[in-house]
């Protein structure tokens, strides 16, 4: 016996289909109608048939009560080949839904997606993360799904993208945008950022995630966000190979004063990093391969420091720098 | 047998910020249900503040919304409760709670705010 | 928001008499054919604890006394024969759309 494909636990809270099967049933997806956080994983299948048994260019005003029903507050679809028409009529369904974050992962949109119609209502995701996710339309992607979004989103995640740059004109401004989250895509590169980080489209973010995005310096990252326009309170750059000393010939960087958060971590560094802001919060230069305890000079002022998880500390060492959280136990870097 | 326990201090200065720790037992935080923080000022009724989902998805009243965060440590089977600038009003009996049918509560810890 | 409004605020009754406690909701906390809408009782000084979930399925280890019923917007928690230690406040919940809210409290004691 097949085992069923969609699960629903006993509160009604997380429902999660897998569809493995040639010819699935899709029908029993709808024993996830009464979840909260609903999963459906369509095993690879494409879905270009489906345009055959639905009315894409249905007024989805008629599904708007049946919609409403849903408690469906976070959604994931993933491995799936999707037509563009298909994810557009699926979003302007949602639309009148309550869903508020949205996964895509493992997805190969197909084709164009249509503009949003003059009476369409947008979706009014506060997060949208995706990955894996390639699409036909190359770099005018994020303009073209963009368009189908109520301007409030407030978290934004692209990993594994084959292609994170934007087309930046396209792209129309995130106002609420508080959370870029970039990490996992190690061909992004300092250069690439700058492509992504499309210039004053990204006025509000506070945190800003480039974990294994290829970034080499801590000042090639300084000059990136500088060119764009963005001012981030946090920013993530552990797992990367980071190199300690700049390129001489380079400009010298000033960071916003707003960066109070730096995550170092996990960079490969043998040294404190030139470049660094003046003052900090909070700085994590934790599983690096230290060989020292850094220099006062060498470190900005900052209240939270972590280096645990360094070659130089050996539990029980007096801590290297006031104000610093080391554990004196070294963590599995 | 899942079990929930409250920790944190039992008097907040007035304008601080209110922080509280639930630690779970008999069941993992992110492999399944919400994780809630639900309170209950003297001789009043319920109020839910918010929750935490196994996928780390929060969701929070409105009416504290600007107030509050709910965050997690998976590693110790915790999550945790943050409320700022808080007044009198504030003062309550915090229960962390499981699912949004609470099925299993905390024995709540009162929490005073007052100079 | 949805407005849960318990009926009567405080009841005194007989120790074996039925008791019925209403709760109205501003809208209806139905998603398609499930209400989620629950019962709970507090002693002071304690949690709340789940009596009936779902409007009417009654929770693992509750006296059979307690049951539920209603749909939408109605619906009513009914103790068949009062005991002694049903002294305590009923609160009913909902959990259809968020914020998920609580009735203002019933207050049952007896007689």
């Known amino acids: 016996t097949t085992p069923e494909p969609c699960e629903l636990d006993d509160e009604d809270f997380r429902c999660v289909c897998n569809f493995s099967e040639p010819q699935p049933d899709w029908s029993e997806a709808f024993q996830c109608v009464s979840a909260v956080e609903v999963e459906i994983h369509a095993g690879g299948l494409n879905l270009e048939p489906f345009l055959k048994r639905v009315d894409a260019d249905a007024d989805p005003r008629q599904y708007a009560d049946t919609v409403k029903a849903l408690r469906v507050r976070r959604l994931t679809v993933g491995a799936a080949q999707v037509p563009a028409q298909l994810l557009v009529g699926a979003l302007r369904v949602l639309a009148y839904s309550r869903l508020k974050e949205l996964t895509l992962e493992d997805l190969k949109i197909t084709g164009t997606m249509p503009p949003l119609p003059l009476e369409a209502t947008g979706l009014a995701l506060s997060s949208l993360r995706l990955r894996n996710v390639s699409w036909a339309t190359g770099r005018s992607w994020l303009a073209e799904l963009q368009q189908w979004l109520k301007p409030g989103l407030k978290v934004l995640s692209i990993a594994q993208a084959h292609s994170p740059a934007f087309s930046c004109e396209q792209v129309r401004a995130f106002p609420a945008l508080t959370s870029l989250d970039l990490s996992d895509n190690p061909g992004l590169g300092e250069r690439g950022l700058m492509a992504a980080l499309c210039p004053h489209k990204f006025p509000a973010i506070q945190n800003l995630a480039l974990r294994n995005t290829g970034m080499e310096t801590p000042t090639g990252v300084c000059a990136a966000l500088a060119a764009a326009g963005v001012q981030p309170h946090s920013l993530d750059l552990s797992h990367n190979s980071l190199r300690a000393t700049v390129n001489p010939s380079a400009p010298r960087c000033m960071w916003s004063s707003a960066l109070n958060s730096l995550n170092l971590s996990f960079a490969g560094l043998e040294q404190v990093p030139k470049g660094l802001p003046a003052k900090l919060r909070v700085l994590d230069l934790s599983c690096n391969r230290l060989n020292r305890a850094p220099q006062p000079d060498e470190l900005p002022e900052v209240d939270n420091l972590t280096l645990d998880g360094n070659p130089f500390l050996v539990p029980g060492t007096a801590l290297p720098h006031e104000g610093s959280m080391n554990s004196g136990v070294v963590p599995a870097c | 047998q899942l079990q929930l326990q409250e920790s944190g201090p039992g008097l907040v200065k007035p304008s601080e910020t209110l922080s509280l720790t639930c630690t779970v037992s008999?069941?993992?935080?992110?492999?399944?249900?919400?994780w809630n923080w639900i309170r209950q000022p003297p001789g009043k009724g319920l109020e839910w503040i918010g929750y935490?989902?196994?996928?780390?998805?929060?969701s929070y009243n409105p009416s504290l919304k600007s107030r509050v965060t709910i965050s997690r440590d998976t590693s110790k089977n915790q999550f945790s409760l943050k409320l700022s600038s808080v007044t009198a009003a504030d003062t309550a009996v915090y229960y962390c709670?499981?699912?949004?049918?609470?099925?299993?509560w905390g024995q709540g810890t009162l929490v005073t705010v007052s100079s | 928001d949805i407005q849960l409004t318990q009926s009567p605020s405080s009841l005194s009754a007989s120790v074996g008499d039925r008791v019925t406690i209403t709760c109205r909701a501003s809208?209806?906390?139905?998603?398609?054919?499930?209400?989620?809408l629950h019962w709970y009782q507090q002693k002071p000084g304690k949690a709340p604890k789940l009596l009936i979930y779902?409007?009417?399925n009654l929770q693992s280890g509750v006296p059979s006394r307690f049951s539920g019923s209603g749909s939408r917007t109605d619906f009513t928690l009914t103790i068949s024969s009062l005991q002694p230690e049903d002294v305590a406040t009923y609160y009913c919940?909902?959990?259809?759309?968020?914020?998920?809210?609580f009735g203002q409290g019933t207050k049952l004691e007896i007689k």
């Open positions: 008999g069941g993992s935080i992110s492999s399944d249900s919400a």
């Open positions: 779902r409007a009417s």
């Open positions: 709670v499981r699912g949004l049918r609470f099925a299993y």
């Open positions: 809208e209806s906390v139905d998603s398609y054919v499930t209400s989620f």
């Open positions: 919940q909902q959990s259809n759309e968020d914020p998920y809210t």
């Open positions: 935490i989902s196994y996928s780390g998805s929060t």
